[in-house]
């Protein structure tokens, strides 16, 4: 299927001009390659009329041009002084020959309709209303006023001043006069439909002295706006229907042959195909609203219509707006898993793509909720603190520059199952949807922390160990201290990774973290996790409570605990003379450093893991190390 997209049908009248926009995929080659507009002949050959190489055919000389808009990935063909000879089949395309990627466009140029010379033309959109002005002479002021619609032979009454109304105009037509002006009457027709189009005559008086005026009413279907979107990206339908329908229910539907199937409306209806990836947002009191769809699929391509009616369904004679959505399968958005599976008590690491050109954009993760019009409250973000109910179990890791950030959620429950969105404050096309499925755990977790009831005593040494299975042997293990701004990775290195081993003892693989001496700031959530390069894997969480020596070992409620802590960890105890100031200068404080420092995080993690020379003025130290016991046979 060609990734070029444009208007399928273009219609105009003689003497007018048209502007045809064609879309192409966002690649450097496409931006700079030849663009063309050609006319298809009976033989199937397509004769170039204009191209971006500067070619202009004789028949287009002085009346056409082709402009490339590389920043929008579009090119536009403007043709003026149209004649009926321009009616035909055309292609807009890309490539060195006219057999390249292209899109078929049908252009129809019709004659200007011949109307009586004094005819007043009103052009209105479907669903809108028209007020027809009917002037008359003063002597016809007392006479009957009327508006009729011309049919083949006669003129069928619409409304008159004796309050006679054609049944098909009841509730839609009214005849009135303004103020004291006795030389003009008005007829207003609302909820216009295609059937209302045609020639009308308004009349005041009877016989030869009657005042008559010819009116041509044109009722137009709105021109569909073209939307060119990448597979897996998102689209927003901005619907502006006007103040007159501000209080009506709104809907978005997709054309399906003769009907328009509602996808979503403000009365709570939603197509199951769009579950988890659609929101409808009323914008203001002027009848404006928008519908956002993420995770676009190729089957989402088609003709969409928005409208307003108390039923929340399409209704003839009510204002609409239309779009033609094209889904480009040559997507720049990477193909990621759209369903992530986890188990109760376990964890998931979700890789969220973002536009690599916008590495400094703010990253967010929100949970889609379908109640009402649907909404997606942010749970975590690069500058947004973790929501309270996710304390200790949710963090966002931004890997600057590589087009991916990771969201980790652990201590999973079945209530976490649902739809989540990855989004940034930058390129909105890169909003993606993930469905999280959570099954009941049927086996022990891969990562286990001991001791499980972790209460550390102030001033003493406290060690927690994280046991991992052999399958994680080659992966990097880490501990991090969680705060509502993220999980600061604690520098460590894996002793066992440097040793050669023949076998792996399932029971003895562990990575330990030592707090020495324990301080009050150490209280909070800690995570043990595995990762391979920038790809995060499983995690498990433990809450470490801190008590004074004198007190018993009563458990501190994790949600009441202060989760903020210093992050200054190393593998072994270091000289206590290292000052606090020096300590702060250590690079890579973790992925949730303040914005000023975050630029330096980049590739220093590797360097940091090896050095482990941080300390603090009061002689505290933290250590994190891996121990492997090898059995040689």
């Amino acid at each position: 299927k060609s990734p070029i997209f444009g208007p399928q049908e273009v219609s105009s009248i003689e003497g007018d001009s048209v502007s045809i926009t064609c879309y192409y995929p966002d690649t450097s080659v496409n931006r700079h390659t030849r663009k063309y507009w050609c006319r298809q002949g009976a033989s199937g050959m397509c004769t170039t009329l204009i191209s971006s190489n500067g070619y202009l055919s004789k028949e287009y000389s002085g009346r056409a041009n082709l402009i490339n808009f590389p920043e929008n990935n579009t090119f536009v063909i403007n043709i003026e002084q149209l004649t009926q000879d321009d009616t035909g089949s055309y292609k807009c395309g890309l490539g060195t020959s006219n057999r390249g990627l292209s899109f078929d466009v049908s252009l129809e140029v019709s004659q200007v309709p011949e109307l009586p010379s004094d005819t007043h033309v009103y052009t209105k959109d479907i669903g809108r209303n028209v007020t027809i002005e009917c002037p008359f002479k003063r002597e016809n002021a007392p006479s009957k006023k009327s508006l009729c619609k011309k049919t083949n032979q006669s003129c069928e009454l619409v409304i008159d001043s004796t309050e006679k109304v054609n049944p098909s105009y009841i509730g839609r037509a009214k005849l009135f006069m303004k103020g004291t002006d006795l030389t003009v009457f008005y007829v207003n027709i609302s909820h216009l439909t295609h059937n209302d189009a045609g020639l009308y005559i308004c009349q005041a008086g009877e016989g030869p002295s009657a005042d008559k005026k010819n009116v041509d009413l044109q009722v137009l279907a709105p021109e569909p706006e073209l939307l060119y979107k990448d597979l897996r990206s998102s689209v927003t339908f901005e619907c502006d229907l006007g103040r007159e329908v501000a209080n009506e229910a709104k809907y978005l539907c997709r054309m399906n042959k003769e009907t328009c199937d509602v996808i979503i409306n403000t009365l709570g209806k939603r197509d199951p195909d769009f579950e988890g990836r659609i929101l409808i947002t009323p914008k203001d009191d002027n009848g404006r609203f928008s519908v956002l769809i993420t995770g676009l699929r190729k089957e989402d391509a088609g003709h969409y219509q928005c409208g307003a009616h108390s039923s929340g369904l399409p209704q003839e004679g009510w204002p609409i707006q239309t779009w033609q959505l094209f889904v480009n399968e040559e997507s720049t958005i990477p193909n990621r898993r759209s369903v992530v599976k986890g188990v109760t008590g376990g964890s998931v690491a979700i890789a969220c793509p973002y536009n690599p050109k916008e590495s400094s954009s703010l990253k967010y993760w929100c949970r889609w909720e379908g109640d009402g019009n649907g909404h997606c409250p942010v749970l975590v973000g690069t500058q947004a603190q973790v929501q309270e109910e996710y304390e200790g179990r949710l963090a966002l890791f931004d890997q600057p520059g590589n087009g991916t950030y990771t969201v980790i959620l652990n201590q999973l429950t079945t209530e976490d199952a649902g739809f989540y969105w990855c989004l940034t404050n930058g390129d909105s096309r890169w909003r993606t949807t993930i469905e999280l499925q959570v099954a009941e755990a049927t086996r022990e977790p891969n990562l286990e922390v001991t001791p499980q009831n972790a209460t550390a005593v102030l001033g003493e040494t406290f060690t927690v160990s994280c046991h991992y299975p052999c399958k994680f042997y080659s992966q990097e293990k880490y501990w991090c201290k969680w705060s509502n701004k993220g999980c600061h990775i604690l520098p460590s290195h894996d002793e066992g990774a440097r040793q050669s081993s023949v076998s792996c003892d399932q029971s003895s693989q562990l990575v330990s973290m030592t707090l020495n001496p324990v301080s009050k700031e150490d209280e909070g959530w800690y995570w043990c996790g595995v990762k391979q390069g920038q790809t995060y894997g499983e995690t498990t969480a433990i809450y470490i409570a801190v008590e004074e020596r004198t007190r018993g070992s009563s458990h501190v409620n994790p949600t009441d605990a202060n989760a903020r802590a210093k992050v200054a960890l190393e593998e072994e105890v270091v000289d206590s003379s290292i000052s606090e100031k020096e300590n702060k200068a250590i690079p890579n404080p973790g992925p949730f450093a303040n914005e000023r420092e975050i630029q330096n995080v980049g590739d220093q993690a590797q360097e940091n893991r090896a050095s482990g020379d941080a300390g603090s003025a009061d002689g505290q130290s933290r250590s994190s190390s891996s121990k492997h016991h090898h059995h040689h046979h």
Partner: nanobody, 127 residues
Amino acid sequence: QVQLVESGGGLVQAGGSLRLSCAASGRSFSSYNMVWLRQAPGKEREVVAAVTWSGGGTSYADSVKGRFTISRDNANVRVYLQMTGLKPEDTAIYYCAATQDWYGGSRAFRAASFHSWGQGTLVTVSS
């Protein structure tokens, strides 16, 4: 294709004004967006100003915004560059060129493909 010939360059004192003109021949002048570029000795060629085919849209380099004005006359197949408040750093050879590309900002025109160039006109601004 269009053939282009620039004129109007010369020596002017800082703060002074000049009007450059570019005469085009060829039947398709009105089909093109027109661009004024300049090249100072030892520097890269840069787009100074651009105007759309109809004259309805313009784009300027930050360094000349508010001082230079580009316009076109499709009937007389000409494009103009009105330069005021000239500075010594405006000294360069000025070229006009035709393109079918249109960018939002003049800097992006570096990637544009230009179909026709003039031979250039020298503007010297003395301090």
